[in-house]
C-alpha cells in the first residue's frame, strides 16, 4: 500500500454566470471552496478502484469533480462516462500534485451517472469513481411553523413539518411597531424550538431550510394597549392548532384574566397562566387560549377580561380552506416623467401569501405589510417610470391570485422613421399617444410647411411592447412626392417631435433630425 | 483541509441541558453523500457512538440515550448541533464529532476524521 | 444491540514484535468493521475499514482481516509509535457499536 499514490478528490461547486466552459476545463466559474469526498480504495475490488463520495447535485447547478495526485512523474488520464471516452488533460498545482479535472456544467438527468477516471503514472495504473446524481428536490417542503406547549412546563415548542429539517427560530421583540422590524436592534433571535420567555411584546417564531423562511406571529392582545378600531381577526384552517395570548401589565399581583369564546368561559385544559414581575416591580400576567386541533365550531370572539382593565376581544374564523381576498379588476395608472409613484394591492389571505411583481418577464421580490384592519398590502415601487404591464402574483397553499397594472409615463413624443421603395413609415411611443402630420419639404415650402393628406395611413397601437403602446403613422409613395424630403410629426400635450425622410431610393434613409418642440 | 472543531460548554449541572457544536470545514454535508456523528468517551472508559446525522437530513440516534438527543445541521453554517437533555454526572465524557463517507458502493467510511474532542463535565 | 468484544484488554511486547488483537461480533456484519488506533488525550485515528482495507497514509505493518464475526488487526513488526490503544467498530447495524479497547503497552 506503501508505494500507491495519496489520492484527494474535491467537489468545487460553482456559482453560475453563464459562462461557456468546455466540458474538462479546469478553471471553471466563480467558485465556492473544494469540499473533500473522502476518496478511498473501493474494498475487495480487483485493480486498485478509488471510490469518491457520492455526490448528489441540483438541477442546473454547475460543478467540478477534481482529483489531486501525489506520485512521482506525470500522469495520463482518460474520462469515461457512459461508455464514451472524454479528454483529459492533466496539470500541476504548486504542490506539484497532478490535478484532473471535469466540469459538469447546468446539471442535467443525462449528465448523472458514475463518472470513470483512469489515471496512469509511471509507477502504476489506478481507476477512481465519482457516481453523481441529481437531488430530488420535489420532496422538499416548507411549511408554516406552529406552536404546542410543553409536556409539564410553562413552554412553547416551535415546529415546522418540512423537509430537509428547517432551522427554527423564535424572533423576539420588547418594543411597538417600527422598530420590530426583522434587522432592527430592538429584535432578538433565538436559535432554539423551545421558548420560555413568553413575556415579550412580539413573538414570532420562523423556520428555514433551502426552499426560504416562513414565520408565525404568536397572536396576541394587549389590555395595556389602546384597541384598534377594527375588531382584530384571525383566521385557522380546520385542524390547525389556536394559540391566543392575553397580556396585561398592573401595579400589583391583585388582578386576574379570564378567557371567553362568546360569553363562555374556556374549558379547563384551554387556558395557561404566567405571571411575572418586570423590572419596575410591576406584574405582568399572561393568558393563554389554545386548541391543540380547531374544528367549526370554535370560530366566534374571544374575549380577554381582566378585573383591572377593560376587556379586549378578536375575532377567530375557522375556515376550510384558504383564500386571498383582493379586487382582481386591472387598473391603468398615468404618471409624469419624475412623479413618485408607487402600485399596491390591498388584500385579506389566509395562509399568508408568497408573491412576485413581474415586469417585461422579470420577477422582483415581493413584501408585504399588515394593516391594522386584517388587511395586508403589498406595494411595489422599483418600476423606474418604464411604461408598461406589471402583474402582481400571489399564492398560498390553496388559492392564487393575479392582478395586472398599466403604467403609463406621460412624455413627449420621439420619433423613429425608415423608407422603403413604396412607403415611409414613422413610429413613437410618447404618451397620451401622439397624432401625426406629414408635410412636404419643396422650393415653395422650404420650412416644410405644405401638409401632405394623401396617402397617410395612422395606427394607433400598433405594437404591445410588455404593455407599452407604440404609435406609427405610414405614408404610400406618390409621383407627387418621389424625390422630396418629407418631414413626419408627432404631437401630443407634452410636445411635437419630427423627422426627416429623403423619399428618392429603395432603403432605410432617415436624413436629418429635425428640431424637436 | 478536512476539520471538525467541537464547541461547547466544558462545565453543565446535573439536570440541565448540554448543546455542542459541531464546526465542519473542507467539506460539507450539502452536496457530498456524507454524515457527521457524535461519540463520546468517559475517562478511561470505552467510546460509545450518540447520534448521526446525513447530509439528506436522515438520523439515527443510539438505542439507550434516544429519549435525550436532538441531533440537527445548518448547511449555511458549516455545524452539526447535538442537544443533550437532563444531563447526569455520568455523562461526563470527552465528546467527538467525526465524519462518515457514503460511496456509491455504500457507506464504508465511517469515522475517517474526528474533532480533537471536548471534555464535558457535570458536577453541581 | 450487537456487541464488540475484544481481546485481549491489554498485552504488552516489545519493538519488532509481531501483535495480533481480536474482535468477535455478537452476530454477523459482514465486512462492515473498522480499527481505530488512539493516544492519550488524543482523537482516535482510523487505520483500517471495511474489515482489510488500509486507510491512506497508514503504514503496511498494519493490516486487517477477517469476515463475519471474527476480526483481526495485526502489526507486523511493533514499532515505538504504536504504543497505543486500538478499537474496533461496527457499523453493519444501529446502534454503531465500539469494542472496549486493547491497550498495547511496552513490555
Known amino acids: 500500500n506503501q508505494d500507491l499514490p495519496v489520492i484527494k478528490c474535491v467537489l468545487i461547486n460553482h456559482k453560475n454566470n453563464d459562462s461557456s466552459v468546455g466540458k474538462s476545463s479546469s478553471y471553471p466559474m466563480v467558485s465556492e471552496s473544494p469540499e473533500d469526498l473522502g476518496c478511498a480504495l473501493r474494498p475487495q475490488s480487483s485493480g486498485t478502484v478509488y471510490e469518491a463520495a457520492a455526490v448528489e447535485v441540483d438541477v442546473s447547478a454547475s460543478i467540478t469533480l477534481q482529483v489531486l495526485v501525489d506520485a512521482p512523474g506525470n500522469i495520463s488520464c482518460l474520462w469515461v462516462f457512459k461508455h464514451s471516452s472524454l479528454n483529459c488533460q492533466p496539470h500541476f498545482d504548486l504542490q506539484n500534485r497532478g490535478v484532473v479535472s471535469m466540469v459538469i456544467l447546468k446539471m442535467t438527468e443525462t449528465q448523472a451517472g458514475e463518472y470513470l477516471l483512469f489515471i496512469q503514472s509511471e509507477a502504476t495504473n489506478y481507476t477512481i469513481l465519482f457516481t453523481v446524481s441529481i437531488r430530488n428536490t420535489l420532496l422538499y417542503t416548507l411549511r408554516r411553523p406552529y406552536f404546542r406547549k410543553m409536556e409539564n412546563q410553562d413552554a412553547l415548542v416551535c415546529i415546522s413539518e418540512s423537509v430537509p429539517e428547517p432551522i427554527v427560530e423564535w424572533v423576539l421583540c420588547d418594543s411597538q411597531g417600527e422598530s420590530c422590524k426583522e434587522e432592527s436592534p430592538a429584535v432578538v433571535k433565538k436559535e432554539e424550538k423551545v421558548l420560555h420567555e413568553l413575556f415579550g411584546t412580539d413573538i414570532r417564531c420562523c423556520a428555514r431550510n433551502e426552499l426560504g423562511r416562513e414565520c408565525t406571529r404568536l397572536f396576541t392582545i394587549d389590555l395595556n394597549q389602546t384597541p384598534q378600531t377594527t375588531l382584530p381577526q384571525l383566521f385557522l384552517k380546520v385542524g390547525e392548532p389556536l394559540w391566543i395570548r392575553c397580556k396585561a401589565v398592573h401595579v400589583n399581583h391583585g388582578f386576574g384574566l379570564t378567557w371567553e369564546l362568546e360569553n363562555k368561559a374556556l374549558e379547563e385544559g384551554n387556558y395557561f397562566e404566567m405571571s411575572t414581575y418586570s423590572t419596575n416591580r410591576t406584574m405582568i400576567r399572561i393568558l393563554f387560549a389554545f386548541v391543540s386541533s380547531v374544528a367549526r365550531n370554535d370560530t366566534g370572539y374571544y374575549t380577554c377580561s381582566s378585573s383591572k382593565h377593560p376587556s379586549q376581544s378578536a375575532l377567530v374564523t375557522i375556515v376550510e380552506k384558504g383564500f386571498i381576498n383582493a379586487t382582481n379588476s386591472s387598473e391603468d395608472y398615468e404618471i409624469d416623467q419624475y412623479e413618485e409613484f408607487c402600485f399596491s394591492v390591498r388584500f385579506k389571505a389566509y395562509p399568508q401569501i408568497r408573491c412576485t411583481w413581474t415586469f417585461s418577464r422579470k420577477s422582483f421580490p415581493c413584501e408585504q405589510k399588515g394593516l391594522d384592519n386584517g388587511y395586508s398590502i403589498s406595494k411595489f415601487c422599483n418600476h423606474k417610470h418604464q411604461p408598461g404591464e406589471y402583474i402582481f402574483h400571489a399564492e398560498n397553499d390553496d388559492a392564487q391570485f393575479t392582478k395586472m397594472f398599466t403604467l403609463n409615463i406621460r412624455r413627449k413624443p420621439q420619433v423613429l422613421a425608415e423608407a422603403s421603395a413604396s412607403q415611409a413609415s414613422c413610429f413613437s411611443d410618447g404618451y397620451p399617444l401622439p397624432s401625426w402630420t406629414w408635410k412636404k419639404c419643396s422650393d415653395k415650402s422650404p420650412n416644410c410647411t405644405e401638409e401632405i393628406t394623401e396617402g397617410v395611413w395612422n395606427r394607433k397601437a400598433n405594437r404591445k411592447v410588455f404593455g407599452q403602446w407604440v404609435s406609427s403613422s405610414t405614408l404610400n409613395m406618390s409621383e407627387a412626392i418621389k424625390g422630396f424630403l418629407v418631414k413626419c410629426c408627432a404631437y401630443n400635450s407634452l410636445g411635437t417631435s419630427c423627422e426627416t425622410i429623403l423619399l428618392n431610393s429603395p432603403g432605410p434613409f432617415p436624413f436629418i433630425q429635425d428640431n424637436i418642440s | 483541509q478536512v476539520t471538525l472543531k467541537e464547541s461547547g460548554p466544558a462545565l453543565v449541572k446535573p439536570t440541565e441541558t448540554l448543546t455542542l457544536t459541531c464546526t465542519l470545514s473542507?467539506?460539507?454535508?450539502?452536496?457530498?453523500?456524507?454524515?457527521v456523528s457524535w461519540i463520546r468517551q468517559p475517562p478511561g472508559k470505552c467510546l460509545e457512538w450518540l447520534a448521526h446525522?446525513?447530509?439528506?437530513?436522515?438520523?439515527s440516534y443510539s438505542t439507550s440515550l434516544k429519549s435525550r438527543l436532538t441531533i440537527s445541521k445548518d448547511t449555511s453554517k458549516s455545524q452539526v448541533v447535538l442537544t443533550m437533555t437532563n444531563m447526569d454526572p455520568e455523562d461526563t465524557a470527552t465528546y467527538y464529532c467525526?465524519?462518515?463517507?457514503?460511496?456509491?458502493?455504500?457507506?464504508?467510511?465511517?469515522?475517517?476524521?474526528w474533532g480533537q474532542g471536548i471534555l464535558v463535565t457535570v458536577s453541581s | 444491540d450487537i456487541q464488540m468484544t475484544q481481546s485481549p484488554s491489554s498485552l504488552s511486547a516489545s519493538v519488532g514484535d509481531r501483535v495480533t488483537i481480536t474482535c468477535r461480533a455478537s452476530?454477523?456484519?459482514?465486512?462492515?468493521l473498522a480499527w481505530y488506533q488512539q493516544k492519550p488525550g488524543k482523537a482516535p485515528k482510523r487505520l483500517i475499514y471495511?474489515?482489510?482495507s488500509l486507510q491512506s497514509g497508514v503504514p503496511s505493518r498494519f493490516s486487517g482481516s477477517g469476515s463475519g464475526t471474527e476480526f483481526t488487526l495485526t502489526i507486523s513488526s511493533l514499532q515505538p509509535e504504536d504504543f497505543a490503544t486500538y478499537y474496533c467498530?461496527?457499523?453493519?447495524?444501529?446502534?454503531?457499536?465500539f469494542g472496549c479497547g486493547t491497550k498495547v503497552e511496552i513490555k
Open positions: 467525526a465524519r462518515i463517507v457514503g460511496y456509491g458502493t455504500g457507506w464504508y467510511g465511517f469515522f475517517d476524521y
Open positions: 446525522i446525513f447530509s439528506n437530513d436522515e438520523k
Open positions: 452476530q454477523g456484519i459482514r465486512n462492515d
Open positions: 473542507g467539506f460539507s454535508l450539502n452536496n457530498a453523500r456524507m454524515a
Open positions: 471495511a474489515a482489510s
Open positions: 467498530l461496527q457499523h453493519n447495524s444501529y446502534p454503531l457499536t
